[in-house]
Amino acid sequence: VEVQVSEDPVVALVDTDATLRCSFSPEPGFSLAQLNLIWQLTDTKQLVHSFTEGRDQGSAYSNRTALFPDLLVQGNASLRLQRVRVTDEGSYTCFVSIQDFDSAAVSLQVAAPYSKPSMTLEPNKDLRPGNMVTITCSSYQGYPEAEVFWKDGQGVPLTGNVTTSQMANERGLFDVHSVLRVVLGANGTYSCLVRNPVLQQDAHGSVTITGQPLTF
C-alpha cells in the first residue's frame, strides 16, 4: 500500500476548517473491515484520530477532527480539522495499515490576516518642519509574525530609526506595533506596510503631514 499526501503545506485560516489530504491505493476486494488508519502529530506522535476494527474511533484531539467515511473505501484517508487554531500548526502523519503498511506526513501552516494599520503621531499638533516626530503603525490579530516596511512619499524605504515589536495574545495571534522616528520635512507622506508572509497579504496605512491639519 502506498500512502500519498500533498507535498506543499496546507494553509488554513484561523477559525476555518482545513483538510489534510491523505490517500492510499486499495487492492481489489478491499473492504473497510481490513483498514487501520491512524493520524498523529509527527513530532510528539500524539494520537489525533483513528479508524480501526471497521469503524471510526473518533477524535483524540480536542474533538475537532473527522474523517470522510463515505470516501474511505475509495482510499481517501483525509482528515478534516475544524475551527483551526494557531496551536494546530505543525506536521501530521497519516499511517495506513492493511496487509501492508505505509505512512506520510503533511504540514499544516496556520495563518490569519492582519487588520488595516492604524496610524498615530506623537506629538500630534503644532508640528513644524525640523520637528522630530514618532509615527506608530499598529496592526492586529495576524499570524504568523508580520514583516513591516516603511516608505516616504516618494516610495523610498525608511529603515533607520524603526522599532518594531510583536506580541502574541492568548490565542497566539500577533499584534504588531512599529514605530518610526523621523524629522519632518516641509510636508510629507509616511506609509507603513504590514505583510503576512504566508498569505502574501499586505495591509497599508499612511499619514500625510501638510503643516495643518494632518490627514491619515
Partner: antibody, heavy 118, light 110 residues
C-alpha cells in the same frame, strides 16, 4: 502452502556481525509487509523490526535501532536482518513473520538461533 | 517491562473456561486493536485471534477474544490439555510507532 524459512543463525562473540535470511514461499511476497520477532531463552516475544512491501517504510525497536538493518529482495522472495555490534542480550531465537491485517502476524517461520557469548 | 500487561500465569481444569487479560493504553489497544498468539512448548508462535475478536481459519471456536477501551481479553472455553501453552497479546503502539507484545501468560491445564 505458505512458508517462511529462516537461516543464518549461529554462535558469535560480542561486537560481531551476522546476517539472517528468511526465504518466503506460497504467497505473493512483494505484496506484504514483513517482521522480525525474537525470543530470548525462557523469555517472552519481542518485536525487532518491520518493513513494508516495497521497503520504503521501516520501523525498529529502540533496543536494536542503529545496530540492526531490515531489508528485502522481492525478486528473491527473501527478507534479511543484518545484525551488527551484537551484544549478549541479543541472544535469542529470531522469527521471520508475515504481516497480516490489523497489525497481526499470521505466518511464522520455525526460527533461527543466535547466541552471542564470549 | 512490556507495554501491554498480562498476568504471568493462569490455570484451569479440563472443560473449564479460562480468561486471560491484556491491559494497554489509549495509544495502543485503545487506538488500534489487539491480536493474540499461542505458543505451544518448543514451537513457533501461532496467530490465534486478530482484530480483537476474529479467528483465523483452523482456530477452534473455543477461543474467543474481546476488547473494551484500553483492555482486551482472551477466553478459552472447554479447556483441553493441548491448550497448555504461552499466550501473548500484541498491538501497534501509535505513540511509539512500534509493534508491542505483552509479557505472556503461561496457561497450565491442571
Amino acid at each position: 502452502e505458505v512458508q517462511l524459512l529462516e537461516s543464518g543463525g549461529g554462535l558469535l562473540q560480542p561486537g560481531g556481525s551476522l546476517r539472517l535470511s528468511c526465504a518466503a514461499s506460497g504467497f505473493s511476497f512483494s505484496s506484504y509487509g514483513m517482521h522480525w520477532v525474537r525470543q530470548a531463552p525462557g523469555k517472552g516475544l519481542e518485536w525487532v523490526a518491520a518493513i513494508n512491501s516495497d521497503g520504503s517504510r521501516i520501523y525498529y525497536a529502540d533496543s536494536v535501532e542503529g545496530r540492526f538493518t531490515i531489508s528485502r529482495d522481492n525478486s528473491k522472495n527473501t527478507l534479511y536482518l543484518q545484525m551488527n555490534s551484537l551484544r549478549a542480550e541479543d541472544t535469542a531465537v529470531y522469527y521471520c513473520t508475515k504481516y497480516y491485517y490489523h497489525y497481526a502476524m499470521d505466518v511464522w517461520g520455525q526460527g533461527t538461533t543466535v547466541t552471542v557469548s564470549s | 517491562q512490556s507495554v501491554l500487561t498480562q498476568p504471568p500465569s493462569a490455570s484451569g481444569t479440563p472443560g473449564q473456561r479460562v480468561t486471560i487479560s491484556c491491559s494497554g493504553s489509549r495509544s495502543d489497544i485503545g487506538a488500534t486493536t489487539v491480536n493474540w498468539y499461542q505458543q505451544l512448548p518448543g514451537t513457533a508462535p501461532k496467530l490465534l485471534i486478530y482484530q480483537s475478536h476474529l479467528r483465523p481459519s483452523g482456530v477452534p471456536d473455543r477461543f474467543s477474544g474481546s476488547k473494551s477501551g484500553t483492555s482486551a481479553s482472551l477466553a478459552i472455553s472447554g479447556l483441553q490439555s493441548e491448550d497448555e501453552a504461552d499466550y501473548y497479546c500484541a498491538s501497534w503502539d501509535a505513540s511509539l510507532n512500534t509493534w508491542v507484545f505483552g509479557g505472556g501468560t503461561k496457561l497450565t491445564v491442571l
